[in-house]
Interface confidence: medium
C-alpha cells in the first residue's frame, strides 16, 4: 500500500515544494519568508542532502572513471531504493539506473529511473547527467529564459530605451534591467525601439552588480556591522576578550569561516575554536565525537576528542545568552522546506529516539498511535509523526524547537549531524542574536 | 513557470464516478512521474496513484485498486484520474503532483465529496 511519495504535501493550496531533487535553470523561485518553521525543515533537508552529495558515489562517475565493475543490484532498504537506482519489479532488488541516459535524485520505489534531460539548441550543458542528478542546462550568452516563457531561451535587449540607465547585465535568467534616469523606477515592458542605446556585453552571465544587488550588498554588511558591535559589547565579549586580540578591533579573523572549514584545526586555531564554540549552540561531546564517522571533508570542522571537551566549558548561562540561529540563506517559506526535509530524518534520528522526541514535540501517546498506523512502512513513522506535528502546531514549528528537543533528549551526535547538514548544504546559515528575541 | 491545475472534483453519491484532470504547464509530462496525492479530514496524506507518462506504467495504493485508473494525454501536457464505485471514504482533496521521487510541485487541489 503506498502512503505517500518520499515527501508527501504540506499545507493545502502550497506550490512548490522545494527538495533535494533536480535543480535545473526553468523551476519557479519560492517568494522570500523566513518564519521559523522553515529553518527546522531546512535544515534537515540539507542535512540529508548534503551528506549524500558530499561523497562521490561510483554511479556519479562517468563508465570509464569507475574504480571497479558495478554493483548493478542491491536489496531496497524499507521497501526503498538509494539514488542512482530503481525498484524492479518484484521489489526485491534495486536496480542501478544508465549513465547518461536516466537518473533517480532520492529514495524511491520508482519501476523506472527518471530519464535525463537533453539541453535545447541555444542551452549549454552546465553539467551533465549522472545517475544521481538530472542535466542541468543554461541558456547561452546573451540569451536569458524568464519564468513566463521557462520553454525558451529569448535573446537580451542590446540596451536601454531613450531616458533610461542600464543598471543589471544580461544573465542566463534575466533581461538587462533597465531604470529611468531621473526617478530610478524599473522599466519591465518590452522595449519599443532602441534609441540611446547603451550596450550591454552578452557576455558576463550572473554578474549581479545591479543597483538592487548594491543595495542588498550594503544592507547585509550594515547588518553584520551591526551584529559585530553588539557581540563586542555584550557580556559575552568579556568572556572572550582574552582570546580575540583584534577580531572585533580589525584582526580580520573569520570565526564563520573556521568554524565551517574542511581541515583539522592546528594548534594555532584551538583559540579561536573556543571562541567559536562559545558562539555556538551545539557543541558535541567526546565520547560522541568518536563514533561520528571520519567522513571526507564535507565543511564541517571535526575536532578532536581533546578539543571537543575544552569546547564544552563555556557554561549554559552564556549559551542562552547568545544563540546563533539557523536560517534559510535562501528565504524560502520555513514551514514547506521543513515538511520536505522531514523525509531524511529518519536515517540522522536513531530509532528508539523517534517516539521521546515526538512526546518532547508536544504529540499525544495517541497521536504518536495514529501516525504509526497512517505510516506506509517502518522508515515512513518518523515522517508521518513529524507531520502531524507541523500540522499540530503550524508556525511555531521550527527548527530550533527539533533541536532543542534533541539536545533535552541527549542525542547531540543527531542534533549535529542535522545542522552540519543543513550548513554544508548551504541552505542554512548561522544568525548571531539573542536567543528569545530572534526566535520568530 | 511550473503550474499544476486540477479540476473535475464534486459532490457524488456512492457507487457514482469523476473524473479529475491535472494540467500541466512550465514542464513536459513525459519527463517525470505525475502523481494524484488525497488529503481526507483527519488523515494523513495518501498517494493514490501515479504514472510514467513516457512508457505508461501505472501504480495505485490498494485502497483504490480496481477503482481508479489513471492516464495521461502528452500531446494536451494532462494527468487524469477516473474514479469509479466511489465511497464515502474517498471523500478527500485531491491534490496533482509532480513527482521526482519525491513531489516537489502540487496543484492547488480539487474537493470530492462522496455522499449521499
Known amino acids: 500500500m503506498e502512503q505517500r511519495g518520499q515527501n508527501a504535501p504540506a499545507a493545502s493550496g502550497a506550490r512548490k515544494r522545494h527538495g533535494p531533487g533536480p535543480r535545473e535553470a526553468r523551476g519557479a523561485r519560492p517568494g522570500p519568508r523566513v518564519p521559523k518553521t522553515l529553518v527546522l525543515v531546512v535544515a534537515a533537508v540539507l542535512l540529508l542532502v548534503s551528506a549524500e552529495s558530499a561523497l562521490i558515489t561510483q554511479q556519479d562517475l562517468a563508465p570509464q572513471q569507475r574504480a571497479a565493475p558495478q554493483q548493478k543490484r542491491s536489496s531496497p532498504s524499507e521497501g526503498l531504493c538509494p539514488p542512482g537506482h530503481h525498484i524492479s519489479e518484484d521489489g526485491r532488488d534495486c536496480i542501478s539506473c544508465k549513465y547518461g541516459q536516466d537518473y533517480s535524485t532520492h529514495w524511491n520505489d520508482l519501476l523506472f529511473c527518471l530519464r535525463c534531460t537533453r539541453c535545447d539548441s541555444g542551452e549549454v550543458e552546465l553539467s551533465p547527467c549522472t545517475t544521481t542528478r538530472n542535466t542541468v542546462c543554461q541558456c547561452e550568452e546573451g540569451t536569458f529564459r524568464e519564468e513566463d516563457s521557462p520553454e525558451m531561451c529569448r535573446k537580451c535587449r542590446t540596451g536601454c530605451p531613450r531616458g533610461m540607465v542600464k543598471v543589471g547585465d544580461c544573465t542566463p535568467w534575466s533581461d538587462i534591467e533597465c531604470v529611468h534616469k531621473e526617478s530610478g523606477t524599473k522599466h519591465s515592458g518590452e522595449v519599443p525601439a532602441v534609441e540611446e542605446t547603451v550596450t550591454s556585453s552578452p557576455g558576463t552571465p550572473a554578474s549581479p552588480c545591479s543597483l538592487s544587488g548594491i543595495i542588498i550588498g550594503v544592507t547585509v554588511a550594515a547588518v553584520v556591522l551591526i551584529v559585530a558591535v553588539f557581540v563586542c559589547k555584550s557580556l559575552l565579549w568579556k568572556k572572550v576578550l582574552p582570546y580575540l586580540k583584534g577580531i572585533c578591533s580589525g584582526g580580520g579573523g573569520d570565526p564563520e569561516r573556521v568554524d565551517r572549514s574542511s581541515q583539522r584545526p592546528g594548534a594555532e586555531d584551538n583559540v579561536l575554536n573556543e571562541i567559536v564554540s562559545i558562539l555556538q549552540p551545539t557543541q558535541v561531546p567526546e565520547q560522541e565525537m568518536e563514533v561520528q564517522e571520519p567522513a571526507e571533508p564535507t565543511g564541517v570542522n571535526m575536532l578532536s576528542p581533546g578539543e571537543s571537551e575544552h569546547l564544552l566549558e563555556p557554561a549554559e548561562a552564556e549559551r542562552s545568552q547568545r544563540r546563533r540561529l539557523l536560517v534559510p540563506a535562501n528565504e524560502g517559506d520555513p514551514t514547506e522546506t521543513l515538511r520536505q526535509c522531514f523525509d531524511d530524518f529518519a536515517d540522522l534520528v536513531p530509532f528508539d529516539s523517534w517516539e521521546p522526541l515526538m512526546r518532547k514535540l508536544g504529540l499525544m501517546d495517541n497521536e504518536i498511535k495514529v501516525a504509526k498506523a497512517e505510516a506506509a512502512g517502518h522508515r515512513d513513522t518518523l515522517y508521518t509523526m513529524l507531520i502531524k506535528w507541523v500540522n499540530k502546531t503550524g508556525r511555531d514549528a521550527s527548527v530550533h524547537t527539533l533541536l532543542d528537543a534533541l539536545e533535552t533528549l541527549g542525542e547531540r551526535l543527531a542534533k549535529q549531524k542535522i545542522e552540519d547538514h543543513l550548513l554544508s548544504s548551504g541552505k542554512f546559515m548561522y544568525l548571531e542574536g539573542n536567543a528569545d528575541s530572534a526566535m520568530s | 513557470e511550473v503550474q499544476l491545475v486540477e479540476s473535475g472534483g464534486g459532490l457524488v453519491q456512492p457507487g457514482g464516478s469523476l473524473r479529475l484532470s491535472c494540467a500541466a504547464s512550465?514542464?513536459?509530462?513525459?519527463?517525470?512521474?505525475i502523481g494524484w496525492v488525497r488529503r481526507a479530514p483527519g488523515k494523513g496524506e495518501e498517494l493514490v496513484a501515479r504514472i510514467y507518462p513516457t512508457n505508461g506504467y501505472t501504480r495505485y495504493a490498494d485502497s483504490v485498486k480496481g477503482r481508479f485508473t489513471i492516464s495521461a494525454d502528452t500531446s494536451k501536457n494532462t494527468a487524469y484520474l477516473q474514479m469509479n464505485s466511489l465511497r464515502a471514504e474517498d471523500t478527500a482533496v485531491y491534490y496533482c503532483?509532480?513527482?521526482?521521487?519525491?513531489?516537489?510541485?502540487w496543484g492547488q487541489g480539487t474537493l470530492v465529496t462522496v455522499s449521499s
Open positions: 512550465g514542464f513536459n509530462i513525459k519527463d517525470t512521474y
Open positions: 503532483a509532480r513527482y521526482w521521487s519525491y513531489f516537489d510541485y
